[in-house]
């Protein structure tokens, strides 16, 4: 069966297309091509007589068509109006006719697109920006790229106008990026130059660095202020509410206690019309801002209850500090047997009782800092009971009476390892 194949099917304007004939019959007189889906003399493009090898142009000939001896038709410099159907009429030697129809589509070679914007300086969380891909082209598909990636999914991004317009609602600083649009049709794809979206924002709440609060007299005070802002913020400093200077850095050499106070950094963005402040307290003092870790020394760590006394001493090299004591997370002293002396450096317990056994630590502090010692364990023992009063059962010691201690302990089971050890020592 006679068929027509268009190569290519989708043709770019200005290019060429070949209407290729398949299964051409034998013993032909000639053939003619027509524009459209039927044979119409007024729409004849070109004819060809095989015997004379002569081509004859028809009424629809444009000067761009060339017929091959095998009946295929080449059309050059394609124009939009060439889109559609083409019919080949074959006249056989027996004058029996045969027809076949083919078609192709014409698309423009796309120009390089460009992006127009309705707002070149949008403000964060306030403005929307609409990008439009120009020019508007029939039968073109529009795509958008952000930093050379396809569009992220976001409720703030909206495509409209056949994807030709990209709208960003309530822009954020994160929308500051490179935007490109791309136009595509079956014969070409073109990408625009980048448009950089410059979102104006800030200033954010300023940060004052360094974070130190305490300074010694004679030191240099150097403070720096930074607030994220586009365009960059303008900075000013106030001390105790009084304007000092319009700089990002504040430097005061050789400070004294009189420089203590509240230091305010003011950041302003004249384009967004926003400003923010941060207040930092500076304290100039002789006191050490870092108190060293104290150490506890004990006259002994294992004592005999109701007999011995013990002295715990909190050692520190810092001056101008205070000391406090803790036992089992409770502040001391907690009984009349406990006494503090030498400005709380020494804790004395006299006499030591069973309930005094446990963990002790001290804390040294001044108005601006504190530090605590490692804990120390105080062990409290009682004198060993006579041999005849103890029965050893499963490594546990039980009282057997005759000593009057039964009244006190009610014959309860006690893990009294120190007494047991003492007993074995005398064996």
């Amino acid at each position: 069966k006679l068929t027509i194949e268009s190569t290519p099917f989708n043709v770019a304007e200005g290019k060429e297309v070949l209407l290729l004939v398949h299964n051409l019959p034998q013993h032909l007189f000639g053939y003619s091509w027509y524009k459209g889906e039927r044979v119409d003399g007024n729409r004849q493009i070109i004819g060809y007589v095989i015997g004379t090898q002569q081509a004859t142009p028809g009424p629809a000939y444009s000067g761009r068509e060339i017929i091959y001896p095998n009946a295929s038709l080449l059309i050059q410099n394609i124009i939009q109006n060439d889109t559609g159907f083409y019919t080949l009429h074959v006249i056989k030697s027996d004058l029996v006719n045969e027809e076949a129809t083919g078609q192709f589509r014409v698309y423009p070679e796309l120009p390089k697109p460009s992006i127009s914007s309705n707002n070149s300086k949008p403000v964060e969380d306030k403005d929307a920006v609409a990008f439009t891909c120009e020019p508007e082209t029939q039968d073109a598909t529009y795509l958008w790229w952000v930093n050379n990636q396809s569009l992220p999914v976001s409720p703030r991004l909206q495509l409209s106008n056949g994807n030709r317009t990209l709208t960003l609602f309530n822009v954020t600083r994160n929308d500051s990026a490179s935007y490109k649009c791309e136009t595509q049709n079956p014969v070409s794809a073109r990408r625009s130059d980048s448009v950089i979206l410059n979102v104006l924002y800030g200033p954010d709440t300023p940060t004052i660095s360094p974070s130190d609060t305490y300074y010694r007299p004679g030191a240099n005070l150097s403070l720096s202020c930074y607030a994220a802002s586009n365009p960059p913020a303008q900075y000013s400093w106030l001390i105790n509410g009084t304007f000092q200077q319009s700089t990002q850095e504040l430097f005061i050499p050789n400070i004294t206690v009189n420089n203590s106070g509240s230091y305010t950094c003011h950041a302003n963005n004249s384009v967004t019309g926003c400003n923010r402040t941060t207040v930092k307290t500076i304290i100039v003092t002789e006191l050490s801002p870092v108190v060293a870790k104290p150490q506890i020394k004990a006259s002994k760590t294992t004592v005999t209850g109701d007999k011995d006394s013990v002295n715990l001493t909190c050692s520190t090299n810092d001056t101008g500090i205070s000391i406090r004591w803790f036992f089992k997370n409770q502040s001391l002293p907690s009984s009349e047997r406990m006494k503090l002396s030498q400005g709380n450096i020494t804790l004395s317990i006299n006499p030591v009782k069973r309930e005094d056994a446990g963990t002790y630590w001290c804390e040294v502090f001044n108005p601006i800092s504190k530090n605590q010692s490692d804990p120390i364990m105080l062990n409290v023992n009682y004198n060993a009971l006579p041999q005849e009063n103890l029965i050893n059962v499963d490594e546990q010691l039980y009282f057997q009476g005759g000593s009057g201690l039964n009244d006190i302990f009610e014959a309860q089971k006690i893990e009294w390892h120190e007494a047991r050890a003492h007993h074995h020592h005398h064996h």
């Epitope: 070109i46 000939y61 050059q76």
Partner: nanobody, 119 residues
Framework: EVQLVESGGGLVQPGGSLRLSCAAS????????IGWVRRAPGKEEELVAG????????RYADSVKGRFTISADTSKNTAYLQMNSLRAEDTAVYYC????????????WGQGTTVTVSS
């Protein structure tokens, strides 16, 4: 009506020059590729030159390169073939043709103009 009418042929001595003209009607030569084909007895038909006004490109057969120049005047809808340093083997009937920019295919239907190179 679509027509291609050739003129400018004649008798010329070897080494001489001729200028052929092709007047087109019924279509614009600026939209297509136009050229010259020659037929000589006992020789194969040869496409000697072509010009595509819409791309600005020209093409020549190796046998005429450097001697023949094709041009077009779109305001007159006419194509020309300037033939210099003519040789006896250039003797042929020259036809104005619609040619392909990229393929060796063409159509012509004019009467042609005869060029004879002889001393």
């Amino acid at each position: 009506e679509v027509q291609l009418v050739e003129s400018g042929g004649g008798l010329v001595q070897p080494g001489g020059s001729l200028r052929l003209s092709c007047a087109a009607s019924g279509f614009n030569i600026k939209d297509t590729c136009i050229g010259w084909v020659r037929r000589a007895p006992g020789k194969e038909e040869e496409l000697v030159a072509g010009i595509c006004e819409y791309t600005g490109s020209t093409r020549y057969a190796d046998s005429v390169k450097g001697r023949f120049t094709i041009s077009a005047d779109t305001s007159k809808n006419t194509a020309y073939l300037q033939m210099n340093s003519l040789r006896a083997e250039d003797t042929a009937v020259y036809y104005c043709a619609i040619v392909s920019q990229s393929r060796s295919v063409y159509n012509y239907w004019g009467q042609g103009t005869t060029v004879t190179v002889s001393s």
